[in-house]
């Protein structure tokens, strides 16, 4: 049935997607999360709004994606940062911007970086700036693994559904 | 049969790719478009050249990709921009570069941004510049949805098959 | 058996991967390579360490990925570059950074660029810099085709498993 195995919000979407699960008899876990634009100084992932969804077993726990079944997944994320020119009275210090997708697994007592992108920005006078970072790759993951992100430069995020997102799908 | 459901050019390719559809008994819609290098001040997508293709129901209409069947798709695009140094006599104005993949659906009376990347460039004296933008993500799409792009900075595009492209595939 | 086909560290993970090959009765070729951090002035791809892997027929040949069977593949790669400020005594010359995924097939007497990203960097005084490049797309490939990379700016690569990688998977 359409919507079966989906979160409430994704199920709602899927009622309009009658053919969504017909292409494969097997389940195809997939998730696409967007940064919550109402939280300006943090990056909280949401799946119950706009075009975000959790499908076929993906779930969200403590701002992390929980891997529903062992296998190979393509994992991806994007952030866009922006900033204004610095004031002539202030000193311009370089800004370190970074975004990382991390894996937390019962095997390891720490977060393992899977995907990392970095940038140094040097704000100038009268010079607003914008910078985008994207990355994605295939990883062997285990049921129960936690995928999370770490970002340096959160106050500079341009939080919109099309600029800041995080997702994964089973291959 | 090889070539079934392909555009003429892709069908031609697929006749020599007899195994292309054997890995899955179900259809796997996929498309990869490249920017037409002969059109310097616009971004026209082409599927009948180089390594571009439309497979298993994808089609191109009004410079948009038409979604062949409802389901989850990974959608991606890249652009590369370049520019020369500004002349000492000219004033250097900042350049806003942006690239967006948009969804037009009968559900909404407007184009919904799915993927957006942005950059401000400040051309300097004797300083040619280059900038690349890439993004991709998974979306729930409906049969007949239109995927298109919008780009700020089109005159600065480096139009080649490996630098400017737009594609999607069903998961 | 769980753990079969993984690197030693990943094998440990895969003992908890009993379902890894059950999701599809058909084979799903996939590969994820990382840049060898012990080779500082070259970019050598490795699949037998960290989270890198070769699955279901992918193989390496002369630092290239060999396509295991004809079909459509999503191919991706990322690099991160970094540099220090130039010394006041030295002249600052612009740095051309580029990363390209190439296809070698004897059909052509040359490597065909599939994915290209480029950047010009102008190192400044007291200004360390960082730059990330990512790209990926879907291509129709033939059994035995060779996928390789070419990079300008290799001495500036930040070689770690999460920053420099190259991969592909069958759709």
């Amino acid at each position: 049935l359409p919507g079966v195995g989906l979160t409430p919000s994704a199920a709602q979407t899927a009622r309009q997607h009658p053919k969504m699960h017909l292409a494969h008899s097997t389940l195809k876990p997939a998730a696409h999360l967007i940064g919550d634009p109402s939280k300006q100084n943090s990056l909280l992932w949401r799946a119950n709004t706009d075009r975000a969804f959790l499908q076929d077993g993906f779930s969200l726990s403590n701002n992390s994606l929980l891997v529903p079944t062992s296998g190979i997944y393509f994992v991806y994320s994007q952030v866009v940062f922006s900033g204004k020119a610095y004031s002539p009275k202030a000193t311009s210090s370089p800004l370190y911007l970074a975004h990382e997708v991390q894996l937390f697994s019962s095997q390891y007592p720490f977060h393992v970086p899977l995907l990392s992108s970095q940038k140094m920005v040097y704000p100038g006078l009268q010079e607003p700036w914008l910078h985008s970072m994207y990355h994605g790759a295939a990883f062997q993951l285990t049921q129960g693994d936690q995928l999370s992100t770490h970002t340096d430069g959160i106050p500079h995020l341009v939080l919109s559904p099309s600029t800041v997102f995080f997702g994964a799908f089973a291959l | 049969l090889p070539g079934v459901g392909l555009t003429p050019s892709a069908a031609q390719t697929a006749r020599q790719h007899p195994k292309m559809h054997l890995a899955h008994s179900t259809l796997k819609p996929a498309a990869h478009l490249i920017g037409d290098p002969s059109k310097q001040n616009s971004l026209l997508w082409r599927a009948n050249t180089d390594r571009a293709f439309l497979q298993d129901g994808f089609s191109l209409s009004n410079n948009s990709l038409l979604v062949p069947t409802s389901g989850i798709y990974f959608v991606y695009s890249q652009v590369v921009f370049s520019g020369k140094a500004y002349s000492p006599k000219a004033t250097s104005s900042p350049l806003y570069l942006a690239h967006e993949v948009q969804l037009f659906s009968s559900q909404y009376p407007f184009h919904v941004p799915l993927l957006s990347s942005q950059k401000m460039v400040y051309p300097g004296l004797q300083e040619p510049w280059l900038h690349s933008m890439y993004h991709g993500a998974a979306f729930q799409l409906t049969q007949g949805d239109q995927l298109s792009t919008h780009t700020d900075g089109i005159p600065h595009l480096v139009l080649s098959p490996s630098t400017v492209f737009f594609g999607a595939f069903a998961l | 058996l769980p753990g079969v086909g993984l690197t030693p560290s990943a094998a440990q993970t895969a003992r908890q991967h009993p379902k890894m090959h059950l999701a599809h009765s058909t084979l799903k070729p996939a590969a994820h390579l990382i840049g060898d951090p012990s080779k500082q002035n070259s970019l050598l791809w490795r699949a037998n360490t960290d989270r890198a892997f070769l699955q279901d027929g992918f193989s390496l040949s002369n630092n290239s990925l060999l396509v295991p069977t004809s079909g459509i593949y999503f191919v991706y790669s990322q690099v991160v570059f970094s540099g220090k400020a130039y010394s006041p005594k030295a002249t600052s010359s612009p740095l051309y950074l580029a990363h390209e995924v190439q296809l070698f097939s004897s059909q052509y007497p040359f490597h065909v660029p599939l994915l290209s990203s480029q950047k010009m960097v102008y190192p400044g005084l007291q200004e360390p810099w960082l730059h990330s490049m990512y790209h990926g797309a879907a291509f129709q490939l033939t059994q035995g085709d060779q996928l390789s990379t070419h990079t300008d700016g290799i001495p500036h690569l930040v070689l770690s498993p999460s920053t420099v990688f190259f991969g592909a998977f069958a759709l």
């Epitope: - | 790719h17 195994k19 | 690197t7 030693p8 892997f53 004809s70």
Partner: antibody, heavy 118, light 107 residues
């Protein structure tokens, strides 16, 4: 049913040349590469290289580069192994093989014996 | 080139015995190992690919395991038709190399 039939083997003098053929049937010839693998008498197996009939792509074991050339003729559904400057140590049974996935030798011909001797 | 070292080079066993053949790679090869069976005067036959996957039509008594550098082919209950020479092959990187073979003989 996939069938591979080698021919062209025989006795050749050191320094001489020989061309082996592999006639393929039972599948679409351009869909898969053809590998050549050899086995010296009483010894193990050694991969020589492959050719893709679809695009004439080749990949060789470096050991054989320069002396051996692998090619194919789509119109005849046949692959070839051209061997030049043959040495005594090239004496072996030469097999052609068709893979499923590229590095797995799933279908084999019956082999053809090449003897290099004066 | 990657070296594949098989052990033992030969073994004697009886019908119904459990037989284990090992193969060690000179460097880690992920799961990229296949196993073949060859009978005198015949071409080899593919048994196992990707270290543990049985090829189509191969009886379930044949199984493969291992990852990294150490791999095993097991015949759970030896049958008369299993007396042959067995080869491992790495498919991690070219030139793809084979082990020297293990001859399984009747005791």
């Amino acid at each position: 049913e996939v069938q591979l039939v080698e021919s062209g083997g025989g006795l050749v003098q050191p320094g001489g040349s020989l061309r082996l053929s592999c006639a393929a049937s039972g599948y679409t010839f351009t869909s898969y590469v053809i590998h050549w693998v050899r086995q010296a008498p009483g010894k193990g197996l050694e991969w020589v290289g492959y050719n893709n009939p679809y695009n004439d792509g080749t990949n060789y074991n470096e050991k054989f580069k320069g002396r051996f050339t692998i090619s194919s003729d789509k119109s005849k559904n046949t692959a070839y192994l051209q061997m030049n400057s043959l040495r005594a140590e090239d004496t072996a049974v030469y097999y052609c093989s068709r893979p499923t996935m590229l590095p797995w030798f799933a279908y084999w011909g019956q082999g053809t014996l090449v003897t290099v001797s004066s | 080139d990657i070296q594949m070292t098989q052990s033992p080079s030969s073994l004697s066993a009886s019908v119904g015995d459990r037989v284990t053949i090992t193969c060690r790679a000179s460097q880690a090869v992920s799961s990229a190992v296949a196993w073949y069976q060859q009978k005198p005067g015949k071409a080899p036959k593919l048994l196992i690919y990707s270290a543990s996957h049985r090829y189509t039509g191969v009886p379930s008594r044949f199984s493969g395991s291992g990852s990294g550098t150490d791999f095993t082919l097991t015949i759970s209950s030896l049958q008369p038709e299993d007396f042959a020479t067995y080869y491992c092959q790495e498919s991690y990187s070219t030139p793809w190399t084979f082990g020297q073979g293990t001859k399984v003989e009747i005791k």
